[in-house]
């Protein structure tokens, strides 16, 4: 049977979304214990049926990986949880509509910073998502989004950073004093999602000048 | 059986506010977004907006953003429509109606009618 | 906001006859993800709440008598009723779920000659 309020048994059922990875999770009301079942169905936008996640029914734990099932971009997705507890009661709640393009969060990019004498080097990594084009092929972040930048900084001293960005996916910052650290920090920015990942830290050292020696 | 049974006719004075409720049975209220739509002989059928009672988000017609607001009791599994500041023009039949795209099932209607 | 055009605003037909009545939008009703239109048609008789018939242009609802068949793509559409019953007389109305806000038609009002 149904219990008082839905929330006693089931709260917070959401879809955590990062780089395309799409993980649905939820949390136990005040009313669930540790033996509370957990059955979870997705369905498209319009459509009436929804369908169970295998591997996903009568289960004990709290997520569910929904990335394979939500992986068309253009299409929007419910979810829901229904919760069982051991008495036998039962709650149903459901996302909001949920749009991969929309919502996912972006981590930070994958970078190699190499250190010069003079310079700092930075080479940027593509970005693989779980979304797969027609042939079969994983897609990167840069395929998925057109107007994909990045934004780098390299803090010099306390008052002073040198920026760079572009599509491109090598940098230089040059003109740095030899054997010196140097902060940089790389972001991934899509304008048009209004989306910028968390940034990717590396702290460099500059070479030392061994001309002089 | 899915049944919404809304809350009766409403006489009201202009500049008061009115919530009306419907009332889920049949099927869990947290496990399909409610809609509201307003019929007036003026207007045809307007969607006011709709609500996932689940986590309570709403989105509204823009039309209807100052006048309306959309609540669900999870425990009662009851939705309702609240409207304020009333006049002539909020004079109509709202429905209540289930689903996230079209509507499959409606609530009976309840008359709200402004009048001093 | 999309706008929904319907005609005629009401015709009158005898028992049997086939009907046909249109609902224009002012822009594509296309969904790209699955490739079905945005548009459902409901049918509302007098004193009663609206019915659904139709949802996707053409999927017609479970227990909906087969004389009602939708039809069109894009920005054109169509509800017909192969024969009329006395039965069918109610006003019918198209809905587009493609973009917020969802609109609906002014309505096509069926009487029975």
């Known amino acids: 049977h149904a219990p008082e309020d839905p929330s006693d048994l089931l709260q917070h059922v959401k879809f955590q979304s990062s780089n395309f990875e799409n993980i649905l999770t939820w949390d136990s009301g005040p009313e669930g214990t540790p033996d509370t079942v957990y059955s979870i169905e997705y369905k498209t936008y319009g459509e009436r049926d929804w369908v169970a996640k295998k591997g996903c029914q009568r289960i004990t734990r709290k997520s569910c990986n929904l990335t394979v099932e939500t992986g068309n971009l253009t299409e929007l997705y419910y979810a829901r949880v229904t919760a069982v507890s051991a008495g036998g009661r039962s709650a149903t709640k459901m996302t909001d509509r949920f749009s991969s393009l929309q919502h996912t969060t972006l981590k930070p990019p994958d970078v190699t910073c190499i250190s010069k004498v003079r310079s700092i080097q930075m080479i940027v990594h593509p970005t693989p998502t779980p979304i797969r084009a027609g042939d079969g092929h994983r897609l990167t972040l840069e395929d998925i989004f057109h107007d994909l930048f990045y934004h780098l900084e390299l803090q010099v001293n306390r008052t002073y950073q040198m920026h760079l960005g572009g599509k491109q996916r090598e940098y230089e910052f040059f003109g740095l004093t030899p054997d010196t650290e140097f902060l940089g920090t790389i972001m991934i920015c899509v304008p048009t999602w209004a989306k910028e990942s968390a940034p990717y830290m590396c702290r460099v050292k500059t070479l030392p000048d061994r001309t002089w020696t | 059986e899915v049944q919404l049974q809304q809350s009766g006719p409403e006489l009201v004075r202009p500049g008061t506010s009115v919530k009306i409720s419907c009332k889920a049975s049949?099927?869990?209220?947290?496990?399909?977004?409610m809609n509201w739509v307003k019929q007036s002989p003026e207007e045809s059928l307007e969607w006011i907006g709709e609500i996932n009672p689940s986590t309570g988000t709403t989105t509204y017609n823009q039309k209807f953003e100052a006048k309306a607001t959309l609540t669900v009791d999870q425990s009662s599994n009851t939705a309702y429509l609240q409207l304020t500041s009333l006049t002539s023009e909020d004079s109509a039949v709202y429905y209540c109606?289930?689903?996230?795209?079209?509507?499959?099932?409606w609530g009976q209607g309840t008359t709200v009618t402004v009048s001093s | 906001d999309i706008v929904m055009t319907q005609s005629p605003s009401s015709l009158a037909v005898s028992v049997g006859e086939k009907v046909t009545m249109s609902c224009k939008s002012s822009?594509?009703?296309?969904?790209?993800?699955?490739?079905?239109?945005?548009l459902a048609w409901y049918q509302q008789k007098p004193g009663q709440s609206p019915k659904l018939l139709i949802y996707?242009?053409?999927s017609r609802e479970s227990g909906v008598p087969d004389r009602f068949t939708g039809s069109g793509s894009g920005t054109d559409f169509t509800l017909t009723i192969s024969s009329v019953k006395t039965e069918d007389l109610a006003v019918y109305y198209c809905q587009q779920y493609f973009s917020y806000p969802f609109t609906f038609g002014s309505g096509t009002k069926l009487e029975i000659k």
């Open positions: 822009q594509s009703l296309l969904y790209s993800s699955n490739q079905k239109n945005c």
């Open positions: 049949g099927y869990s209220l947290t496990a399909d977004y």
């Open positions: 109606a289930r689903f996230d795209a079209y509507f499959d099932y």
């Open positions: 996707w242009a053409s």
